[in-house]
């Protein structure tokens, strides 16, 4: 018979390892994207990052981040995004709602979108790791 498994209790070191990996991969992506010269960041795009009303790691907007990165993957064949997505999926609940992204059509605007989101993703992973470690410190004091 079909019985749902018990709710998975993940050790915090596993979650920290996932976010550390994402932080490292986000730097790799940004370095790769920044090689394209003459592209400026845009104020038109905002990557959702951390939610103030949830505890780490559920405060990371993983489904939305995944959708944005999937869009970049479709616009520009960055293989590092495959690995990023696999790690984000470790943080995404299987019933999480889908996020729709409106994709720029102009080639130069696409490049601005990729740079802007990649930069915000890198900053977001720095924040996520900080929120995790500060949360862990609070839990032990």
């Amino acid at each position: 018979s079909h019985t749902l498994p018990v709710r998975l209790l993940r050790p915090s070191d596993d979650v920290q390892k996932i976010v550390e990996e994402l932080q490292s991969l986000s730097k790799m992506l940004l370095k790769d994207v920044e090689e394209e010269k003459g592209v400026l960041v845009s104020q038109n795009y905002t990557l959702p990052c951390l939610s103030p009303d949830a505890q780490p790691p559920n405060n990371i907007h993983s489904p939305a981040i995944r959708a944005y990165l999937k869009t970049i993957r479709q616009l520009d064949n960055k293989s590092v995004i495959d690995e990023i997505i696999e790690h984000l999926d470790k943080l995404i609940f299987q019933d999480a709602p889908e996020t729709n992204i409106s994709v720029p059509t102009d080639t130069h605007e696409c490049k601005r979108f990729i740079l802007t989101i990649s930069q915000q993703f890198s900053e977001c992973m720095d924040l996520a790791l900080k929120s995790l470690t500060s949360g862990a410190q609070q839990a032990t004091t």
Epitope: P5, K17, E86, L91, Q94
Partner: antibody, heavy 122, light 107 residues
Framework: QVQLVQSGAEVKKPGSSVKVSCKAS????????MQWVRQAPGQGLEWMGA????????RYSQKFKGRVTITADKSTSTAYMELSSLRSEDTAVYYC???????????????WGQGTTVTVSS | AIQMTQSPSSLSASVGDRVTITCRAS??????LAWYQQKPGKVPKLLIY???TSASGVPSRFSGSRSGTDYTLTISSLQPEDVATYYC?????????FGGGTKVEIK
């Protein structure tokens, strides 16, 4: 109750292709990765690749890259694995497997198809 | 690719014996490891997921543990129906490779 039903046994000539199907019923998840695994006679389990059916996103083992194509039809809850340029060493039982759990990423494959025997012989 | 080194490749033990099978990952994979049992001519069956969580309906004599990059499947009291080949598989990042398998027989 989750059930995975695979297509029947196939006998193929070297150089040809085979397409194995895996139909899921009773499976309600939307965000998940499923995998294809094969087992040659008397050998261990070998990972071939995976698909995220909701988006058609795929990952392949380096060993099979260029020869294997994994696809999914959301409307019929069916996944497919096509292997081309068959050789005698591809004679094996091919399995599809699906995870259960609360996250999009798997941490174990709870459900397995019954296996499809593919024999490659001239 | 992450390598999973499983040992021993085969073992023979008596009914009631405690049996341990080990998988070593070539790098840190957290708890993203599963154990399967495959009886001759049958489909693999999930025993343990997330390194130490038992799958539904699995007898309590089967347990999983982790120490760093070493993962252990323990059968606390071997039964005749446990004759099978056991495999580990990691899920840290693709390719999700398997260990080479451990064939368990009764003395």
């Amino acid at each position: 109750q989750v059930q995975l039903v695979q297509s029947g046994a196939e006998v193929k000539k070297p150089g040809s292709s085979v397409k194995v199907s895996c139909k899921a019923s009773g499976y309600t998840r939307t965000r998940y990765w499923m995998q294809w695994v094969r087992q040659a006679p008397g050998q261990g389990l070998e990972w071939m690749g995976a698909i995220y059916p909701g988006e058609g996103d795929t990952r392949y083992s380096q060993k099979f890259k260029g020869r294997v194509t994994i696809t999914a039809d959301k409307s019929t809850s069916t996944a497919y694995m096509e292997l081309s340029s068959l050789r005698s060493e591809d004679t094996a039982v091919y399995y599809c497997a699906f995870p259960e759990g609360q996250y999009a990423a798997p941490y174990g494959m709870h459900y397995w198809g019954q296996g499809t025997t593919v024999t490659v012989s001239s | 690719a992450i390598q999973m080194t499983q040992s021993p490749s085969s073992l023979s033990a008596s009914v009631g014996d405690r049996v341990t099978i080990t998988c070593r990952a070539s790098r840190n994979i957290g708890n993203y490891l599963a154990w399967y049992q495959q009886k001759p001519g049958k489909v693999p069956k999930l025993l343990i997921y997330y390194a130490k969580t038992s799958a539904s309906g699995v007898p309590s004599r089967f347990s999983g543990s982790r120490s760093g990059t070493d993962y252990t499947l323990t059968i606390s009291s071997l039964q005749p129906e446990d004759v099978a080949t056991y495999y580990c598989q990691h899920f840290w990042k693709t390719p999700w490779t398997f260990g080479g398998g451990t064939k368990v027989e009764i003395k």
